[in-house]
Amino acid sequence: SGTTNTVAAYNLTWKSTNFKTILEWEPKPVNQVYTVQISTKSGDWKSKCFYTTDTECDLTDEIVKDVKQTYLARVFSYPAGNVESTGSAGEPLYENSPEFTPYLETNLGQPTIQSFEQVGTKVNVTVEDERTLVRRNNTFLSLRDVFGKDLIYTLYYWKDSSTGRKTNTTHTNEFLIDVEKGVSYCFFAQAVIPSRTVNRKSTDSPVECMGQEKGEFRE
């Protein structure tokens, strides 16, 4: 039984990129406030976003404690005001979220090409190792720190004037590609976790072309 004038939350959805994780739900509150709880399958429930009028709750601080755990959240609806005035103090309404395993499900954020350096007919392209909100020993871990060899990058590159694209992959954050001397190339990168069944690929990085500021050229 729910308390008077409250409705259960619905459409509970996890929104997560590089472990920044927010639970969203509906409806916008009229006569109620929400409290969110999160737990692992074996753990205790922890309350977050207490008595909030928002319809989202940032759960990053909780999930980064162990990104390989599976989490469940639930959203409670409480009447917007003192319970006594609503005439009922029954169990509050709540709705469960889908299960969420950050390591397997967080979206890979858009990568950034940090730099590229041409030496003769070779170009070294470096993808930025993005910082996540996952901590170890009071320092924030990078995407590579968290995923290790599970994470690869794919580089798509082509002659500036051509439509034919080539690809290269790396288990690090660096590519070494062959180019023709005196020819400008463009490229973008994509983060990939091949072992995943969902959310395997990031969106494409912005395109960078040789001759732009990020590049260095040496004979």
């Epitope: 309350s47 003192n82 006594e84």
Partner: antibody, heavy 119, light 113 residues
Framework: QVQLVESGGGVVQPGRSLRLSCAAS????????MHWVRQAPGKGLEWVAV????????YYADSVEGRFTISRDNSKNTLYLQMNSLRAEDTAVYYC????????????WGQGTLVTVSS | DIVMTQSPDSLAVSLGERATINCKSS????????????LAWYQQKPGQPPKLLIY???TRESGVPDRFSGSGSGTDFTLTISSLQAEDVAVYYC?????????FGGGTKVEIK
């Protein structure tokens, strides 16, 4: 009339534990959210913890998170605060307070119980 | 966290005169959906627990004398005692209940000049 009576305070050494109680009467205890608020000697008010009327949801100030646990027994009309790993900075008068017209507006307060953490 | 800042720290006012206490929040405590300011004022006399005076920034609690009034919106609020009485000597606190953690101002001590 509404009454809130705290007990369980005293002098305790750093690192030790203490459990405070707040006995409620004169109102339907199970229908109200309850809070602990503290006041260090000569200082201002600091919110410590809250528990919803049903006892399901609890929330804590960062300064006590992981060390203090708020709970309630609606059959006994009693609110509790279990305080572990006490520190000198936890020295304060601890008040229990009842949610009023809205969550976090305190219409009734107990008289408080003094907790002194000292070696 | 929302930080509440009160001014002045102390205030000496003659009996029958007006006392004004200010409270500023680090972010708005106005909830646009119901146009209410989630701010309360409390009075605390020596050796006693606090007593609720005002909630929703301007609504007097039952039994509170009408010489006490609250005003303001968003981030700036005022508690006014229109004609100070001897029994009003106390410390006054503002508190936001807009979001957790709940936070109080540092208090303003009101004395008789």
């Amino acid at each position: 009339q509404v009454q809130l009576v705290e007990s369980g305070g005293g002098v305790v050494q750093p690192g030790r534990s203490l459990r405070l109680s707040c006995a409620a009467s004169g109102f339907t205890f199970r229908s109200y959210g309850m809070h602990w608020v503290r006041q260090a000697p000569g200082k201002g008010l600091e919110w410590v913890a809250v528990i919803t009327y049903d006892g399901i949801n609890k929330y804590y100030a960062d300064s006590v998170e992981g060390r203090f646990t708020i709970s309630r027994d609606n059959s006994k009309n009693t609110l509790y605060l279990q305080m572990n790993s006490l520190r000198a900075e936890d020295t304060a008068v601890y008040y229990c307070a009842r949610d009023g017209v809205y969550y976090g507006v305190y219409d009734y307060w107990g008289q408080g119980t003094l907790v002194t953490v000292s070696s | 966290d929302i930080v509440m800042t009160q001014s002045p720290d102390s205030l000496a006012v003659s009996l029958g005169e007006r006392a004004t206490i200010n409270c500023k929040s680090s972010q708005s405590v106005l909830f646009s959906s119901n146009n209410k300011n989630y701010l309360a004022w409390y009075q605390q006399k020596p050796g006693q627990p606090p007593k609720l005076l005002i909630y929703w920034a301007s609504t007097r609690e039952s039994g509170v004398p009408d010489r006490f009034s609250g005003s303001g919106s968003g981030t700036d609020f005022t508690l006014t005692i229109s004609s100070l009485q001897a029994e009003d000597v106390a410390v006054y606190y503002c508190q936001q209940f807009h979001s957790y953690p709940l936070t109080f101002g540092g208090g303003t001590k009101v004395e008789i000049k």
